[in-house]
């Protein structure tokens, strides 16, 4: 008889990414005997929770917990029964909850309490629901991308860990309520809030990170809507022929539009707003989001935030990817250079509603907003982060790496489950030379 080699036992981990617009559940898996390898943890499955983000249940917190049930039931099917008790389960909430915490700490606590109550009812090893800081969100997204692309370490043929020659990849994340930029830098930060030191696999990394609250896709759209109401009484970024009823209460209820709120307004009033497909006026409207005139440091991105010059290659994911992919795939426009991105944005912004609908059949939910978001992305990269044609060549727009969604969730789990050692492991078990 011959010994049959058993497949290596798998371990599992679950992260609920509670974003501002929706919650996604990610189930990860990895071979138990290779926990310290880089790029060994991968996505097993995912599930998008129906309805809005947990912060949208501020007035009915119990529904925040209830909303997660469908995906948690899927997790019960995706993870083997004998692994339930050893499967860590985390919930991390991001900018939507950070915003709610600004306006109503009590409601925030109740929402977290409600989701905790739901999560503790499941047989997994629940390890808490918490709100990530902007810095956490940026750094964990950076860790995810570089872990999946195996930029931290390589396993050498001589049976020991070796550091690859290639550098790390910067990470840019565009969520619903905030946007993050994170990259390795050699220059010390002039603002300690923007510097993070990491020790991974025996290597030291100095990382610059910043999260801009209210600069996520949905909040930017709300702010532009508020500006359009204030300045134009029409929306230059919306396509001509498109009009909708805007409920003033919804526009001004976010802390992000507080500064644009009129002294007095009828909160139950609705205003009819029409699009005009005016790329030039849309550009002006978007440029109002960036204050680049004052900088208390030697160099800034915008709004007086310190930023060293962008260096190396970058991966831009989440709404960065979806928007640029729309320009490329649906509109059929090249976006390989900053100039092409600008031209593609202008072309999209000059489309009428009829033209846009003809280009994108069977799809309408976010169609009127692609112009504004594309315009914002172009300006964020060029005017905000100061990418030029040369540095922009190093930016790739992706949603996945190694079949795993790029975002903060994996990095968060790797950190909390100690799956990335700070120092090099000793001699590899089972390595021998004949």
């Amino acid at each position: 008889t011959q010994d049959v080699r058993e497949p290596p036992a798998l371990k599992y981990g679950i992260v609920l990414d509670a974003g501002s617009s929706h919650t996604s559940m990610f189930v990860y898996k990895w071979p138990a005997d290779k926990e310290n390898d880089t790029g060994i943890v991968g996505q097993h499955s995912s599930c998008d929770v129906r309805g809005g983000g947990i912060s949208s249940y501020a007035n009915d917190p119990s529904r925040a917990g209830q909303s997660l049930v469908e995906c948690l039931e899927q997790a019960l099917r995706d993870v083997p029964k004998d692994r339930y008790a050893s499967t860590p389960l985390y919930l991390g909430a991001t900018a939507g909850m950070r915003l709610l915490n600004l306006t109503s700490p009590e409601a925030t606590a109740k929402v977290l309490e409600a989701v905790t109550q739901t999560l503790t009812r499941y047989p997994f090893d629940f390890r808490g629901a918490r709100i990530l800081s902007g810095q956490d969100e940026g750094v964990f997204g950076w860790v995810t991308a570089n872990y999946l692309l195996e930029n931290f370490i390589k396993y050498g043929w001589v049976g020991r860990w070796i550091r690859p020659r290639k550098g790390t990849l910067g990470a840019m994340d565009l969520g619903g309520a905030s946007t993050q930029i994170t990259f390795e830098t050699t220059s010390p930060s002039e603002d300690p809030d923007n510097e993070v030191h990491l020790r991974l696999y025996g290597q030291h990394y100095r990382v610059y990170t910043h999260s801009f609250l209210c600069y996520g896709r949905d909040q930017v759209l709300q702010r532009l809507l508020a500006s359009a109401l204030q300045i134009h009484r029409f929306h230059p970024c919306w396509p001509k022929g498109y009009s909708t009823q805007v409920l003033l209460r919804e526009v001004y209820q976010s802390p992000c539009t507080m500064g644009q709120r009129p002294q007095t307004f009828n909160s139950s009033a609705t205003v009819s707003l029409s699009g005009t497909s005016n790329a030039a006026l849309c550009r002006d409207l978007v440029s109002g989001l960036f204050n680049i005139s004052s900088c208390p440091f030697s160099q800034c991105s915008f709004n007086g935030v310190f930023q060293p010059p962008v260096a190396g290659n970058f991966i831009a994911f989440s709404a960065f990817y979806y928007t640029v992919d729309f320009l490329k795939t649906v509109m059929g426009l090249p976006v390989g250079t900053l100039k092409q991105l600008e031209d593609a944005t202008e072309t999209t912004c000059n489309q009428t509603w009829a033209e846009l609908q003809a280009r994108v059949p069977g799809q309408q939910t976010r169609l009127p907003d692609y112009c504004a978001v594309a315009m914002f992305i172009h300006q964020l990269l060029s005017r905000g982060y100061r990418f030029d044609e040369r540095s922009f060549r190093g930016v790739v727009f992706e949603k996945k790496a190694a079949d795993t969604a790029v975002g903060w969730a994996l990095g968060y789990m790797l950190n909390l489950t100690n799956l990335i050692p700070a120092d090099l492991p000793g001699l590899r078990k089972g390595t021998h030379f004949s």
Partner: antibody, heavy 120, light 109 residues
Framework: QVQLVQSGAEVKKPGSSVKVSCKAS????????VSWVRQAPGQGLEWMGR????????RYAQKFQGRVTITADESTSTAYMELSSLRSEDTAVYYC?????????????WDQGTLVTVSS | SYELTQPLSVSVALGQTARITCSGD??????VYWYQQKPGQAPVLVIY???NRPSGIPERFSGSNSGNTATLTISRAQAGDEADYYC???????????FGGGTKLTVLG
């Protein structure tokens, strides 16, 4: 009432090309789009590509990229689909379908289809 | 790439309600369209935008769509409803129309 009328059945040799036409009678392509969908014997529907004549905008399914060309002549309200490098698996009924803005550019009018047989 | 999955066949007794499902990743976020195809004929649009009927389509045909499943419901099924039914949706990521594999509806009795 708009009707679509396609060209007749074709028998082609492997490696050759076929060009199928689709004429809108009783209407024009103004504000409409045209998609081409094929159906192999006993199989389901497979989208090949679309054209928005008034925008000069075309999109092709990745599977057919480089092998299919969709064009339109607005003056005669006729759309064309040319498929090259034919192989036996391309034997199918080829439908042209009008995409209407009233139905969010889904296919509201279909022709009876053109049978293309690829055989040596 | 985006895929829509339908059951190969569904049977319903004459006069009863038939339900044909179409599942796809987060399909509830997209609009779904349903086509009826009888043997030797071209497809006919029976439902657009999830739950709307084109003129000429009986009220017995209705649609719903949420989460990962869209459903075509045919109430008081008649012999004339026997056909293949295809769901379709536009995949924004690849800028293409996607059809489900089709479901053969059999009306018994």
């Amino acid at each position: 009432q708009v009707q679509l009328v396609q060209s007749g059945a074709e028998v082609k040799k492997p490696g050759s090309s076929v060009k199928v036409s689709c004429k809108a009678s009783g209407g024009t392509f103004d504000s409409y789009a045209v998609s081409w969908v094929r159906q192999a014997p006993g199989q389901g529907l497979e989208w090949m590509g679309r054209i928005v004549p008034w925008l000069g905008f075309t999109r092709y399914a990745q599977k057919f990229q480089g092998r299919v060309t969709i064009t339109a002549d607005e003056s005669t309200s006729t759309a064309y689909m040319e498929l090259s490098s034919l192989r036996s698996e391309d034997t199918a009924v080829y439908y042209c379908a009008r995409e209407s803005p009233g139905y969010r550019y889904s296919f509201d009018v279909w022709d009876q289809g053109t049978l293309v047989t690829v055989s040596s | 790439s985006y895929e829509l999955t339908q059951p190969l066949s569904v049977s319903v007794a004459l006069g009863q309600t038939a339900r044909i499902t179409c599942s796809g990743d987060a399909i509830g976020e997209k609009y779904v369209y349903w086509y009826q195809q009888k043997p030797g004929q071209a497809p006919v649009l029976v439902i657009y935008d999830d739950n709307n009927r084109p003129s000429g389509i009986p009220e017995r045909f209705s649609g719903s769509n949420s989460g990962n499943t869209a459903t075509l419901t045919i109430s008081r099924a008649q012999a004339g409803d026997e056909a293949d039914y295809y769901c379709a949706s536009y995949d924004l990521q690849q800028a293409r129309w996607v059809f489900g594999g089709g479901t053969k509806l059999t009306v018994l009795g």
